[in-house]
């Protein structure tokens, strides 16, 4: 990927998903009535014409927003601190690497628009999640719904990263 995002970035993303799964505190079966349409911007991760700058920007903003969401007093009160610390550490490592990559990609002349546009869209999406948590008074079920939503959106974003990596491999081998 541009700065050749290494295999361990994909591994870190999968570890983040594993941690989010382990963080589960209550049965989701208790929370069906709390479901909400957060309107994840699927078009941002589903396209076939993937630019390096776009992919990195989406991943960076996703991870930044997840880090912020799970780095609050409310979050500390809701989740197991050991798992939360591991999540923070993993996210921080991924963010550092992505920031290096983004600088390199911008240096290579890819458009700044490809970077700023997904960031704004994702900020709106995460703002909706924050509003929901506040509306639901940060209940256990609200956090459970959010945890599963974050897992879904991170899974889709990670898939986008894998698609770009395999596209790069195909180009390299042809």
């Amino acid at each position: 990927l541009g700065c050749d995002l290494p295999q361990n970035h994909g591994l870190l993303s999968r570890n983040t998903l594993v941690l989010l799964h382990q963080m589960r505190r209550i049965s989701p079966f208790l929370c069906l009535k709390d479901r909400r349409d957060f309107r994840f911007p699927q078009e941002m991760v589903k396209g076939s014409q993937l630019q390096k700058a776009h992919v990195m920007s989406v991943l960076h903003e996703m991870l930044q927003q997840i880090f912020s969401l799970f780095h609050t007093e409310r979050s500390s009160a809701a989740w197991n601190m050991t798992l939360l610390d591991q999540l923070h550490t993993g996210l921080h490592q991924q963010l550092q690497h992505l920031e290096t990559c983004l600088l390199q990609v911008v240096g290579e002349g890819e458009s700044a628009g490809a970077i700023s546009s997904p960031a704004l869209t994702l900020r709106r999406y995460f703002q909706g999640i924050r509003v929901y948590l506040k509306e639901k008074k940060y209940s256990d079920c609200a956090w459970e719904v959010v945890r599963m939503e974050i897992m879904k959106s991170l899974f889709l974003s990670t898939n986008m990263q894998e698609r770009l990596r395999s596209k790069d491999r195909d180009l390299g081998s042809s």
């Epitope: 799964h21 589960r24 049965s27 989701p28 079966f29 929370c31 069906l32 009535k33 709390d34 479901r35 909400r36 349409d37 957060f38 459970e144 719904v145 599963m148 939503e149 897992m151 879904k152 899974f155």
Partner: antibody, heavy 121, light 107 residues
Framework: EVQLVQSGAEVKKPGESLKISCKGS????????IGWVRQMPGKGLEWMGI????????AYSPSFQGQVTISADKSISTAYLQWSSLKASDTAMYYC??????????????WGQGTLVTVSS | DIQMTQSPSSLSASVGDRVTITCRAS??????LNWYQQKPGKAPKLLIY???SLQSGVPSRFSGSGSGTDFTLTISSLQPEDFATYYC?????????FGQGTKVEIK
């Protein structure tokens, strides 16, 4: 292509045990729950229970609690429905269907083809 | 448990007719209501989810409306392939429950 493929029809005697299966493919099996639905001959649909294959957490309809066991093996993307002692009244078509869990997405959007279970002496 | 009551239990209609099936929940379920079509010997097929969202691949002659306790499935112009049994199902809370079904027959 998303598919749920169920095991074949079964003919059993009262008191026998049985385990039927539902294999998912074409999607991330652990990202969706699997529900089971019964349809007795000429009757309507009855929800039996559901499983989260990611950790095998289950929920049952009170009508079926203790009568059946739902399980899953995520390593082979398969969910199961089992009986330890069948009764003639268990004769029915059994369907599995996938559910998006707490995500805002269509419920039971894909169904298995059904497994006909006949219990007769 | 949330009880789901469908009406009518059966109806006869002709090709081209506008058909309406209603479903009532015993308590408010917001918009957590799905509609399925089932043909003899086949698995049910999802038509409408969250009361009014048309499932991908389902013809636009099918539509759903309602919220709270009262819901409606409408077929704007009945086609030969629409003769089947229709079920509503609440997905608001466990245990999930279905209506008893409405059989749409040829007049």
């Amino acid at each position: 292509e998303v598919q749920l493929v169920q095991s074949g029809a079964e003919v059993k005697k009262p008191g026998e045990s049985l385990k039927i299966s539902c294999k998912g493919s074409g999607y991330s099996f652990t990202s969706y729950w699997i529900g089971w639905v019964r349809q007795m001959p000429g009757k309507g649909l009855e929800w039996m229970g559901i499983i989260d294959p990611s950790d095998s957490d289950t929920a049952y309809s009170p009508s079926f609690q203790g009568q059946v066991t739902i399980s899953a093996d995520k390593s082979i993307s398969t969910a199961y429905l089992q009986w330890s002692s069948l009764k003639a009244s268990d004769t029915a078509m059994y369907y599995c269907a996938r559910h998006p869990g707490l995500n805002w997405a269509p419920d039971f959007d894909y169904w298995g083809q059904g497994t006909l279970v006949t219990v007769s002496s | 448990d949330i009880q789901m009551t469908q009406s009518p239990s059966s109806l006869s209609a002709s090709v081209g007719d506008r058909v309406t099936i209603t479903c009532r929940a015993s308590q408010s379920i917001g918009s957590a209501l799905n509609w399925y079509q089932q043909k003899p010997g086949k698995a049910p097929k999802l038509l409408i989810y969250f009361a009014s969202s048309l499932q991908s691949g389902v013809p636009s002659r099918f539509s759903g409306s309602g919220s709270g306790t009262d819901f409606t499935l409408t077929i704007s112009s009945l086609q030969p392939e629409d003769f089947a049994t229709y079920y509503c199902q609440q997905s608001y809370d466990f245990p999930l429950t279905f209506g008893q079904g409405t059989k749409v027959e040829i007049k």
